[in-house]
């Protein structure tokens, strides 16, 4: 941080390394929950027109796809990977791409991804070919 910029103690609005370098915040699609037509596709665009500056520099981009008997929704947000989201850990937060992984949720199909490149939650990927955890 330059000497004329105060560093406030115990404030997570600024992230620095040991040399005092400052981390720029992530730019993410941030439309909260919207109805979606994304279904049975290898990848989908978010169709979210809002790109927001994440409030905290440690936050990453997140997308949540949910399908139940009534509708399909896609949620796009910023979130701190140190904290669970929808009760799940963001295990893929360092990925440059948003690779959807299915999570167990009763009564619905639930996929979630996180990533850390600008607007990376605009393109959500379901295709297995991107899934590096596939043992094959």
């Amino acid at each position: 941080i330059p000497p004329h910029v105060q560093k406030s103690v115990n404030n997570d609005m600024i992230v620095t390394d040991n040399n005092g370098a400052v981390k720029f915040p992530q730019l993410c699609k941030f439309c909260d929950v919207r109805f979606s037509t994304c279904d049975n596709q290898k990848s989908c665009m978010s169709n979210c027109s809002i790109t927001s500056i994440c409030e905290k520099p440690q936050e990453v981009c997140v997308a949540v796809w949910r399908k139940n008997d009534e509708n399909i929704t896609l949620e796009t947000v910023c979130h701190d990977p140190k904290l669970p989201y929808h009760d799940f850990i963001l295990e893929d937060a360092a990925s440059p791409k948003c690779i959807m992984k299915e999570k167990k949720k009763p009564g619905e199909t639930f996929f979630m991804c996180s990533c850390s490149s600008d607007e990376c939650n605009d393109n959500i990927i379901f295709s297995e070919e991107y899934n590096t955890s596939n043992p094959d």
Partner: nanobody, 124 residues
Framework: EVQLLESGGGLVQPGGSLRLSCAAS???????RMWWVRQAPGKGLEWVS?????????YYARSVVGRFTISRDNSKNTLYLQMNSLRAEDTAVYYC?????????????????WGQGTLVTVSS
């Protein structure tokens, strides 16, 4: 020598407007994403708005959407922030900063990424 020089701050009543400017020199302005960042007294940095070097794509923090407008004039190497409907919580020192698009970190605290700031006070 790289310089970022902010101006345009001052005292304004709630609901009022101000236009901040940041004059840049000593580097290729059109290679950098430019930011407005603010720091309220005793608080951390808040990243307010950013604009791409070419094409003028803009980004905003949720707290200022619809009230603030960032712009740049590459021919004048100048960055602007038009602030409307100002609130008491907008009171802060406003800095401009530069970022190579895609790069996550500034080089270090001694590097030339920040201006000296301009104080905006919103009070009746």
């Amino acid at each position: 020598e790289v310089q970022l020089l902010e101006s345009g701050g001052g005292l304004v009543q709630p609901g009022g407007s101000l236009r901040l400017s940041c004059a840049a020199s000593g580097f290729t302005f059109t290679e950098y994403r430019m930011w407005w960042v603010r720091q309220a007294p005793g608080k951390g940095l808040e990243w307010v708005s950013a604009i791409e070097p070419i094409g003028n794509r803009t980004y905003y923090a949720r707290s200022v959407v619809g009230r603030f407008t960032i712009s740049r004039d590459n021919s004048k190497n100048t960055l602007y922030l038009q602030m409307n409907s100002l609130r008491a919580e907008d009171t802060a020192v406003y800095y401009c900063a530069k970022q190579i698009p895609g790069r996550k970190w500034t080089a270090n605290s001694r590097f030339d990424y920040w201006g000296q700031g301009t104080l905006v006070t919103v009070s009746s």
